[in-house]
């Protein structure tokens, strides 16, 4: 049966009993050899008389004396079978045997569940030889004991490539309950319930479990570890923790944070990265996302013009990265910007709004009804057109571009002339006879150059003809007009 | 099914000791403490304390220290409120009430009324 | 210890109509519990932790608010809700109950 050692009892002798024969219990040993970091097991010489043999392996001798009588059967001593103690109290515990004196190299070595110990550990081992037998004493000492000292611990001897294995000492280390599993912090929905799991163990066992909230208990009663807490719902966030009590006191888990989800804050710093004429690149800083991660984002823009209808653009992105591109806008127009954002709750308010301009951009249509016609007198060709609708200028007339392509006779050459904004017509010089003429016009802003119009044909035939109608751009549908005299 | 049936009611004179029992079924005893709460006639509901089931440790409300005993008979899955020196003013229905999480009173028994008169 | 005054102590009402009865605590709480009471019965747990129904309970009645607010709600009043209804707050030891109301069908 084993025996038990409360720490309460009695320190129990170094080894069981007085060995018999010539040696005593205050005897001085004859070599001590300590062993703290990379054990290394104990040299034998000498011997004693065994002792009694118990439950360990056991050597049998095949060695007989002079007056030939077999020797008995080799074991170690029995000893304190269970040591409970409390943590970082120290622990000391032996092994001893009786080893013949005819046995030389033999050695002991320390096992802990199984596995040598070769660490630095506080092994001794002490040798108090006699005539005929050396009592060998290992002893195993930790100053402060852990958890992790917890297990089975037992004495090796190889004689003559026999083992002779120990009786185990189990060494059981008690404390304060040690958890495995703490709440962990969350972010949860307003009045919904959820889960929260605490466990601890021994020993000594067993654990049991009340939950905090609020520095208010939640279970008059322990639950035994582990223990699952189901939490109602919240209306506001709450601070969770599980105390872990058994018969050494209590440990207390970490204190929880436990989030209500809520609809972000709005979005901040919505600031214009850049403009063009028809987008606005702008960034915004998120708001608070209400322990819920974002989803996505909305851009409102609205027209500033106090005349336009009031009515809201409204265009949808991700979330990230914060940066959003806003097309299709008016040039030289200004607007105002918001930004919303969204996680699973809900839209937040508007940010606060911003105001944004387009700038100058190259006018979106070409002057309409182009219209060309000769002037032999002076020898010019005259050109009309009316400039394009305001609203698609996208910008201030500062003129326009009249592109003049002369073809004949398989020479081509163009010609551009700029003219400014006053006015809509232009004269040019005619530059071939015998040729056709081909006049484009483009409005011009600071933003750059208009589409061109469709082009307008007309013959400039050689001197000394008369009568010239004008050319003028076609109705739909008429690619290619061409005038001829 | 889980109940909580308590004994039936009690005629007694001022100075005498009433026990009233509470006797659990359906659920494990020793889980959840047993609550005692006083409902004088035409009154509310007042906590009296609770016993823990597993432990066997009392804990009474300050109106309540001194007289009032809560006890268990846990082979029998039974709480017991015991009363010394009755008085007039004792004179009330007595509910046992199992706690759940969140001081929950959450299977109540079937009461018990005790009249204290001379 | 924590008070809780309920209001109003009688509540009269006909069938079909909403009522609304309050409690309110002395100090904050994070949850409040319901108990209906009907006479020489006992006690029976109507609503755990603020807005949860116990069993068996019909989806009528509601159960709102937060920190020293709380509210049980019956959207239509029926002939069998007339009883008393308690309020009792765990947060804080003792843990109270309110003193109740009485609601009547007229």
């Known amino acids: 049966a084993i025996t038990e050692a409360r720490e309460e009892a009695k320190p129990y002798p170094l080894f069981p009993g007085p060995f018999p024969g010539s040696l005593q219990t205050d005897h001085t040993p004859l070599l001590s050899l300590p062993h703290a970091s990379g054990y290394q097991p104990a040299l034998m010489f000498s011997p004693t008389q065994p002792g009694r043999p118990h439950t360990g392996n056991v050597a049998i001798p095949q060695v007989t004396s002079v007056e030939s009588k077999p020797l008995p059967p080799l074991a170690f001593k029995h000893t304190v079978g269970h040591i409970i103690l409390s943590e970082h109290k120290g622990v000391k515990f032996n092994c001893s045997i009786s080893v013949p004196n005819i046995y030389q190299d033999t050695t002991i070595s320390w096992w802990k569940d199984g596995k040598e110990l070769l660490g630095a550990h506080h092994a001794i081992t002490q040798f108090y030889p006699d005539d005929e037998v050396t009592a060998i004493i290992a002893s195993f000492s930790i100053t402060s004991v852990q958890r992790s000292d917890n297990g089975s611990y037992i004495c090796k001897m190889k004689i003559n490539n026999e083992e002779i294995v120990s009786d185990p000492i189990y060494i059981e280390v008690q404390g304060l309950p040690h958890f495995t599993k703490q709440p962990e912090s969350m972010n949860v929905t307003r009045n919904t319930a959820f889960n929260l799991t605490c466990q601890a163990v021994g020993p000594p066992e067993p654990v049991n479990i009340f939950w905090v909230q609020n520095s208010s208990r939640v279970n008059e009663q322990p639950e035994k570890s582990p223990s699952v807490l189901t939490v109602p719902g919240l209306t506001e966030m709450a601070v969770f923790s599980c105390e872990a009590h058994n018969d050494k006191g209590l440990t207390v888990s970490k204190g929880v944070q436990i989030n209500i989800k809520a609809i972000p804050s709005p979005p901040t710093e919505v600031s214009i990265r850049n403009s063009t004429a028809h987008s606005i690149l702008i960034s915004w800083v998120p708001g608070f996302d209400g322990y819920s991660p974002f989803r996505n984002c909305s851009i409102q823009v609205k027209e500033a013009d106090p005349l336009s209808n009031g009515s809201v653009m409204i265009f949808n992105t991700s979330a990230l990265p914060h940066l959003y591109q806003i097309k299709q806008l008016q040039a030289l127009a200004n607007y105002s910007i918001g930004v919303s954002c969204m996680n699973e709750i809900g839209w937040s308010a508007v940010s606060p709004w911003i105001l944004a301009s387009t700038t100058e951009g190259a006018p979106s249509v070409a002057p309409l009804n182009v219209t060309v016609f000769l002037n032999e007198s002076s020898d010019n060709v005259d050109i009309r057109w009316m400039k394009p609708p305001t609203k698609q200028q996208d910008g201030e007339l500062v003129g326009y571009r009249i592109s003049h392509v002369w073809q004949s006779a398989g020479i081509s050459k163009e010609l551009l002339e700029e003219v400014g904004q006053n006015g809509s017509r232009a004269r040019i010089s005619v530059q071939v006879h015998n040729a056709t003429c081909t006049v484009r016009i483009a409005a011009v802003t600071r933003g750059g150059v208009g589409p061109f119009s469709d082009p307008v044909k007309i013959f400039i035939p050689a001197h000394g003809w008369v009568d010239y109608a004008p050319s003028s751009t076609p109705a739909p549908g008429n690619a290619d007009p061409v005038l001829i005299i | 099914q889980i109940q909580l049936v308590q004994s039936g009611p009690e005629l007694k004179k001022p100075g005498e000791t009433v026990k009233i029992s509470c006797m659990a079924s359906?659920?494990?005893?020793?889980?959840?403490?047993v609550t005692w709460v006083k409902q004088a006639p035409g009154q509310g509901l007042q906590r009296m304390g609770w016993?823990?089931?597993?432990?066997?440790?009392?804990t009474y409300a300050d109106d309540f220290k001194g007289r009032f005993v809560f006890s268990l008979e846990t082979s029998a899955n039974t709480a017991h409120l015991q009363i010394n020196n009755l008085k007039n003013e004792d004179t009330a229905t007595y509910f046992c009430?199992?706690?759940?999480?969140?001081?929950?009173?959450?299977?109540w028994g079937t009461g018990t009324t005790v009249t204290v008169s001379s | 210890q924590i008070v809780l005054s309920q209001s109003p102590a009688i509540l009269s009402s006909s069938p079909g109509e909403k009522v609304t009865m309050t409690c309110r605590a002395s100090?904050?709480?994070?949850?409040m519990h319901w108990y209906q009471q009907k006479p020489g019965s006992s006690p029976k747990p109507w609503i755990y932790?603020?807005?949860n129904l116990a069993s068996g309970v019909p989806a009528r009645f509601s159960g709102s608010g937060s920190g020293t607010s709380y509210f049980l709600t019956i959207s239509r009043v029926e002939a069998e809700d007339a009883a008393t209804y308690y309020c009792?707050?765990?947060?804080?030891?003792?843990?109270?109950f309110g003193g109740g109301t009485k609601l009547e069908i007229k």
């Open positions: 009430a199992r706690t759940n999480n969140y001081r929950y009173f959450d299977v």
């Open positions: 359906g659920y494990t005893f020793t889980t959840h403490g």
């Open positions: 016993i823990n089931t597993y432990s066997g440790v009392p």
């Open positions: 100090s904050s709480v994070s949850y």
């Open positions: 932790a603020t807005s």
């Open positions: 009792q707050q765990w947060n804080t030891d003792p843990p109270t």
